[in-house]
């Protein structure tokens, strides 16, 4: 080994990664909200729609105060990976009716991937345990009908909206602890 020498700073540090994750999450939340509103305009929802393969909501307002950094980041990454796969599936399986939303769904998928990359980088830099994201619990087969894919889109966007909403709050809270 040679004599001690300093290393130049890399592009970001964990706190900057967390700031970046907050910005990306907020931006993704706004996109999801807008896309969900477009969906409601084009295909009015008759009540709430569920999809068994979607993750259950990780947090409620009451549990925010007890959040720990590892748990939040691990759960958020696993849940977002599930939503990423669901959006992928929706784009592949969507009938002609949803094709009009393809550009928006494509942009949503790309932003989700970017946020997932940022969360993983943050977890690596903090050396937090990184559980391998599971495949969706229920295999995602083709929707039974055109209306089936519309109902699935409502469920996916609604669930993603709620997940991102708690994610923003959780990440902002974690900023104070890092």
């Amino acid at each position: 080994p040679g004599p001690p020498a300093g290393s130049p700073r890399v592009s970001s540090d964990p706190r900057a990664d967390l700031d970046s994750a907050v910005l990306l999450t907020r931006s993704l939340l706004a996109d999801t909200r807008q896309l969900a509103a477009q969906m409601r305009d084009k295909f009015p929802a008759d009540g709430d729609h569920n999809l068994d393969s979607l993750p259950t909501l990780a947090m409620s307002a009451g549990t925010l105060g007890s959040l720990q950094l590892p748990g939040v980041l691990t759960r958020l990454r696993v849940d977002l990976m599930s939503y990423f796969r669901h959006v992928q599936w929706l784009r592949r399986a969507a009938g002609p009716s949803l094709k009009t939303l393809e550009p928006e769904l494509g942009a949503l998928q790309a932003r989700l991937e970017r946020l997932l990359r940022r969360l993983q980088l943050l977890m690596s830099r903090l050396a937090l345990p990184q559980a391998a994201p599971d495949q969706p619990a229920v295999p995602l087969g083709p929707p039974a009908s055109a209306w089936g894919s519309i109902r699935a889109a409502h469920a996916i966007l609604g669930g993603l909206h709620l997940t991102l909403d708690w994610a923003v709050r959780g990440l902002l809270l974690l900023k104070t602890r890092l």
């Epitope: 290393s7 993983q120 980088l121 690596s124 830099r125 345990p129 994201p133 890092l178």
Partner: antibody
Framework: EVQLLESGGGLVQPGGSLRLSCAAS????????MHWVRQAPGKGLEWVAV????????YYADSVKGRFTISRDNSKNTLYLQMNSLRAEDTAVYYC???????WGQGTLVTVSS | QSVLTQPPSASGTPGQRVTISCSGS?????????VHWYQQLPGTAPKLLIY???ERPSGVPDRFSGSKSGTSASLAISGLRSEDEADYYC???????????FGGGTKLTVL
Amino acid sequence: EVQLLESGGGLVQPGGSLRLSCAASGFTFSSYGMHWVRQAPGKGLEWVAVISYDGSYKYYADSVKGRFTISRDNSKNTLYLQMNSLRAEDTAVYYCAAGVPDYWGQGTLVTVSS
Amino acid sequence: QSVLTQPPSASGTPGQRVTISCSGSSSNIGSDYDVHWYQQLPGTAPKLLIYSNNERPSGVPDRFSGSKSGTSASLAISGLRSEDEADYYCSAWDSSLSGPVFGGGTKLTVL
């Protein structure tokens, strides 16, 4: 400028112990997970151990589990590696590294030989 | 034996483009874990070259680029220069080890 400065290496007999230290400066040490990575002479890189930013998580390579202990003191910006029951195959340059790892020290040589 | 597989050597002439591959498994690269690349010049410590599959730290020339697909990744170096002669290592988190794993390294020779 980021600096990681390892110390504590040297010649030790098989079965002996050594404690390596790594002094960090130029970045927020307490915000980074820290690793020890080693490189045997003429060989590739082998990850040894990692400790999370706050010290709550520690993981070890199978080859050192039960013999090596990683720890950190965030108030002193220092990382440690306590190495016990040393074997000839532990001979290597030991690097302290931060983050991904994003930053690496220059390494300290540990030689285990009788 | 390394968990990630790299070719032991690669070579090219100045100005050429060379690619170094890195093959993993379902517990590391294939599990959506990011790949990082390091350059180790003779007699020096490794240096981060590419992180998160394709991002460059500040100061790394854009001649270096990374990509990832499935269970493998690759590092491309275009406009090869004599100072690129070094050992290159890929790395990724491995869920079965709860830590990062490295490739065996590729010695790049500029002819």
